[in-house]
Interface confidence: low
Amino acid sequence: FKIEISPEYKTIAQIGDSMALTCSTTGCESPLFSWRTQIDSPLNAKVRTEGSKSVLTMEPVSFENEHSYLCTATCGSGKLERSIHVDIYSFPKDPEIQFSGPLEVGKPVTVKCLAPDIYPVYRLEIDLFKGDQLMNRQEFSSEEMTKSLETKSLEVTFTPVIEDIGKALVCRAKLHIDQIDSTLKERETVKELQVYISPRNTTISVHPSTRLQEGGAVTMTCSSEGLPAPEIFWGRKLDNEVLQLLSGNATLTLIAMRMEDSGVYVCEGVNLIGRDKAEVELVVQEKPFIVDISPGSQVAAQVGDSVVLTCAAIGCDSPSFSWRTQTDSPLNGVVRNEGAKSTLVLSSVGFEDEHSYLCAVTCLQRTLEKRTQVEVYSFPEDPVIKMSGPLVHGRPVTVNCTVPNVYPFDHLEIELLKGETTLMKKYFLEEMGIKSLETKILETTFIPTIEDTGKSLVCLARLHSGEMESEPKQRQSVQPLYVNVAPKETTIWVSPSPILEEGSPVNLTCSSDGIPAPKILWSRQLNNGELQPLSENTTLTFMSTKRDDSGIYVCEGINEAGISRKSVELIIQVSPKDIQLTVFPSKSVKEGDTVIISCTCGNVPETWIILKKKAKTGDMVLKSVDGSYTIRQAQLQDAGIYECESKTEVGSQLRSLTLDVKGKEHNKDYFSPE
């Protein structure tokens, strides 16, 4: 029979693996098998025999299995033996690549290539490549032979450069045992180089500026170079140098900035191997927003008018408004806010609305207040000019200038001008008590002259509404002056003469100077002194005069300024007729009687009759009353011839009678000598 062993002669097994040796016979039906080592040490294996085949299994393979194994087959009396040598090795894993730290450009790093659990070490070789470049190689042939598993390493120190990015680091381990098939005797590990760059060149760009206004916005962008690309972190330096983290984005946008947002902002670029930071200081300045009140810092409002106060915030996007009075009295108006404007409407203003109104505008937690003074006034009508009478040249006249319903009258000034000349000016500065409407009067007296005609009387009322008002409110009334001149130099012309013969015509013409031109009024003066109007014509004409037309005729020149009167006596002369001389009780009387001698003439006045008593010594004119002469107690010497003569420029008549007076004792007549 024959014996075979498999594998033949020599085999190699990896520690820890399973290894089977098979011994088989041919030409023997039921052989007996036995196994032993050449030096009779323990088998350290299991035997399983089945028919003509016996299998020695080493599981797991260990150092104790490194022997020559002998298989003996007995068939009957025949015995055959075969041996096989078992070599062991250990090369279980790919090498490991280790770094002393991250691969940072420019910083030396140590690379270690480890071959773990190697046996036999003296046959080990380790190569380290960077890309195609062999960096280091080591053979461990000089190592002492020991029956143990060892880990061997190869170290290289190099300084990474940017060009190393993407290159491969190859660690290759070889175990030089001839029987090992090629896939087992060489192992390698490939590691792509992860090269790092610590953050650097960290820069901040700020838009629009590092100096900002309240309420504004700023965008700060941070960039930092490095590998891997640095992560960006934003923070703000607090007083104690502690950094307050704000954001993890490259861009930091701050909106609606306040002054307290001023400070140092820090941007930090961070990656696995380092950090780099940059700082910027932001200065948030207060936004110079302005509060404007219109119509102005002082508003004059007429009683009953509507006042609209507008408060505007200029340079503030979203202001908040509030209105109050300086004395915090109730606000009588309606407030309406719209965007950057607020209006306070005071409808039908009265004295109670006279205040300082304050508009407070809050913008970004900052408040500005602006004031306007509402001054209520009443000045509804033009002044009224009244005069005590018509204007007469040379005659004093009192002028009243009345300004009705004024408030506040302690700011009132009334001026009265004649042409360009101020006649009087009055300031009403007395203390005001309760607020009320008052009527104020300026009164003055002046003497008009004819030269004032054509000029005007101007009453100028000024209401000074407040200290800040440049121009006072002004009202005026103008009254043209027309100065009257009282009639004067009234003259009467009588044509042909004031003494006329009855039946003659006569014209009485009157003229009078004055302004306006006087109206002429002819009148006749009656016996009781009253005037009887006759005509308003300049000329009074008598076509045929009668004795009754004789008398005093009065011409009056009349205008608004007065009356000028002139009179003329018209004498209508007649030739005396029908003269009668009578005595009462008779022509012959007793001594002591009362005697009345009367002379009448039908067509002439009694005043034109002369009574005389004839005597040797000359005629004696008697004092007659209405043509009558009364002797109270007749005396003897009253006896005589009495003569009555009626005489005019145009003729005369004479009558006479003899009075006889009888004596009481002698009872004889007494005749005056004649």
Partner: nanobody, 125 residues
Framework: QVQLQESGGGLVQPGGSLRLSCAAS????????MSWVRQAPGKGLEWVSG????????YYADSVKGRFTISRDNAKNTLYLQMNSLKSEDTALYYC??????????????????KGQGTQVTVSS
């Protein structure tokens, strides 16, 4: 804490000069408009003068224009008011205040707008 400390006031004859100073602390002085205001006896506050953050723009009330000069030194956190040709009407307590001012009610009616204790200026013969 915002603090403003005025100094430099005193008694001066009409036509004389004074220089007021205001030392500021507790805030970024260079970021603020500043003003001088005054209060005459028995009267309200009156704005006198204002200056912008870097001193390039100055503002004056009509009553002091041509006589007073406002200036600032941001490095020293100090505001100044040079007062020349002083008149008796300039007698008042002078304050420095933050804020742009421009009229009596712009700045000093709100607590947000701090002002100092004041320095007395008396103009009298």
């Amino acid at each position: 804490q915002v603090q403003l400390q005025e100094s430099g006031g005193g008694l001066v004859q009409p036509g004389g000069s004074l220089r007021l100073s205001c030392a500021a602390s507790g805030f970024t002085f260079s970021s603020y408009y500043m003003s001088w205001v005054r209060q005459a006896p028995g009267k309200g506050l009156e704005w006198v003068s204002g200056i912008n953050v870097d001193g390039s723009n100055t503002y004056y009330a009509d009553s002091v224009k041509g006589r007073f000069t406002i200036s600032r030194d941001n490095a020293k956190n100090t505001l100044y008011l040079q007062m020349n040709s002083l008149k008796s009407e300039d007698t008042a307590l002078y304050y420095c205040a933050t804020g742009s001012g421009r009229d009596s009610y712009d700045c000093y009616s709100g607590s947000w707008c701090p002002k100092g204790q004041g320095t007395q200026v008396t103009v009298s013969s």
